[in-house]
Amino acid sequence: LPGVGLTPSAAQTARQHPKMHLAHSTLKPAAHLIGDPSKQNSLLWRANTDRAFLQDGFSLSNNSLLVPTSGIYFVYSQVVFSGKAYSPKATSSPLYLAHEVQLFSSQYPFHVPLLSSQKMVYPGLQEPWLHSMYHGAAFQLTQGDQLSTHTDGIPHLVLSPSTVFFGAFAL
Amino acid sequence: LPGVGLTPSAAQTARQHPKMHLAHSTLKPAAHLIGDPSKQNSLLWRANTDRAFLQDGFSLSNNSLLVPTSGIYFVYSQVVFSGKAYSPKATSSPLYLAHEVQLFSSQYPFHVPLLSSQKMVYPGLQEPWLHSMYHGAAFQLTQGDQLSTHTDGIPHLVLSPSTVFFGAFAL
Amino acid sequence: LPGVGLTPSAAQTARQHPKMHLAHSTLKPAAHLIGDPSKQNSLLWRANTDRAFLQDGFSLSNNSLLVPTSGIYFVYSQVVFSGKAYSPKATSSPLYLAHEVQLFSSQYPFHVPLLSSQKMVYPGLQEPWLHSMYHGAAFQLTQGDQLSTHTDGIPHLVLSPSTVFFGAFAL
């Protein structure tokens, strides 16, 4: 039963969330955002659709995730890029694709890159093309920190809930 | 000592798992599956071999992971694909490689893609070739949900415990 | 307030870490290492710089992470490789790039690959080039286990805190 073996206040919390089990008795901040497919030339994160969610204090403001409490968080993101048949014109030079998760903190007056992935694709040599990038890691974050992303190659994003996403959860 | 500072029932749980420490006092559902290397033209997940495991209620049925309790889970998977040395039959047509983690739930009458990665490789252009795909994210899952994978390019999988795997753990 | 609703010894622990909240009340072993950018032809992991850290018993010895307590850990790593601008000397021979997280345990007299990613790049065909590799998964580890990495293509690493990293955390 929910609350069995918990101290009174923890049991009360569990009763308020009847689906919880002992293994899940202390909720933790977590968020999973997806890229808005209706915005083709920008990457706008959405939390109120499909499988996306904000839990336990995480909020989305100015396209950034706001860290609710200090602690260690696992932060992750994925993008998928594609090029339709023969999109480049007079060049065989590669297309630079990159995706970065950045931290803006009261401790620093600039965006600090936390996670970066990069790729050169050669559209003139290989069309159509598809490329996926994923990264994630654990970081010590402070309440109020802002997590955002920067992407080179936004017009080439394959925007769907399972291909372009950004999230974090407290450890 | 295991169980110190825990309420009676939690201490009992800890005593039953003597290796546990306070930091690990509440076991959580977790699973890590590996692709069966003896099955070359299919991707069958195995839990009873190498580093693979099922813990705290996770089970494997019909090649799907069954979610034991409702909550937020981090779900992940990787595949590695390869193409052997140049074959005269290779053309300049691209080979579509994709790997997807899917959710089948009582809430939906179809498989919902949770994580998707895709790649085009050009065997005639680059032989031999190798490509890795990884993805993972946090999802709100319900007891009884089924997590499965779908892969395009199965004959090209490099099936080993460290290259092809699928897992999840409760947060 | 920290410690509210916790048993006495857990409350004492929380008071010693005043920034902690209920959701974070039991610290767990965690580590995040970054590749030393001053070492161009080797991959040396560093914990005392940038966003890197060792927490709750994790230590770094002989370029390996030492597992502090037995349990399930999520282990991850990323590398980014690059090839500089076009050189006429470049041939069409492929360059083999690979990154592996390995386990050395008292249970086995050899390094066991846990996570492996691989790629062939063709420098003569596509210059400049960039490629990212990421992987992570959950493993049952034992106190004293050593986690290390092996990389093919070290001279091509893009060594920065956000591109080359290695970490783990207890679940």
Epitope: T91, S93, P94, E127, D152 | L125 | K84, Y86
Partner: antibody, heavy 115, light 113 residues
């Protein structure tokens, strides 16, 4: 529809250096290479080289190494070419930036080197 | 470096006439894997910057009138204007983007009689 807008004409002394800018508008240019092309009066087109604004990678025509240096500022969507040790006859020309991926060309910047 | 040679260097035609100009490369611009020729044609009108007309040897850029046609493969390429108009007065350049450095032909100057 994107376009490339170049800085205005320059009159420089021999031996000096000049920096010409090329601002991309209507699209984000970081993923696409910006090429630089030189055209002397009565001459054809010469390819100087290119820069990837996102990665910072560059490719130079050997004939312009040491003469031209490319930079880019992603935040302002602007690429630059710096020409050093200017000489009267060799460097006086119209300099164009171009994005071959989309087929965009700037309007050109006239550089006159005269004592 | 790949050398691009254009001919003739200039020609004068009347409005409505058909024009062809040639571009030859010192090595093949055909990429065998995708069967594409890495060649572009540009039009430069007096006092203006070059404008892309044709890429991949035969693909017209958007907005380019269909009287302009690119053809050829390997080392020999042709730009044809089926019925010249007065506004076609310009210098036409071919460019290879098969290898570095990119190189241009010397141009063909089209004059209207």
């Amino acid at each position: 529809q994107g376009q490339l807008q170049q800085s205005g004409a320059e009159l420089m002394k021999p031996g000096a250096s000049v920096k010409i800018s090329c601002k991309a508008t209507g699209y984000t240019f970081s993923s696409y290479w910006i090429e630089w092309v030189k055209q002397r009066p009565g001459h054809g087109l010469e390819w100087i080289g290119e820069i990837s604004p996102g990665s910072g990678s560059t490719n130079y025509n050997e004939e312009f190494k040491g003469k031209a240096t490319f930079t880019a500022d992603k935040s302002s969507n602007t690429a630059y070419i710096q020409l050093s040790s200017l000489s009267t006859s060799e460097d006086s020309a119209v300099y164009y930036c171009a994005d071959g991926y989309h087929g965009y060309w700037g309007q050109g910047t006239t550089l006159t080197v005269s004592s | 470096d790949i050398v691009m040679s254009q001919s003739p260097s200039s020609l004068a035609v009347s409005v409505g006439e058909k024009v062809t100009m040639s571009c030859k490369s010192s090595q093949s611009l055909l990429y065998s894997t995708n069967q594409k020729n890495f060649l572009a044609w540009y039009q430069q009108k007096p006092g203006q910057s070059p404008k892309l007309l044709i890429y991949w040897a035969s693909t017209r850029d958007s907005g380019v009138p269909d009287r302009f046609t690119g053809s050829g493969s390997g080392t020999d390429f042709t730009l044809t204007i089926s019925s010249v108009k007065a506004e076609d007065l310009a210098v036409y350049y071919c460019q290879q983007y098969y290898s570095y450095p990119r190189t241009f032909g010397g141009g063909t100057k089209l004059e209207i009689k």
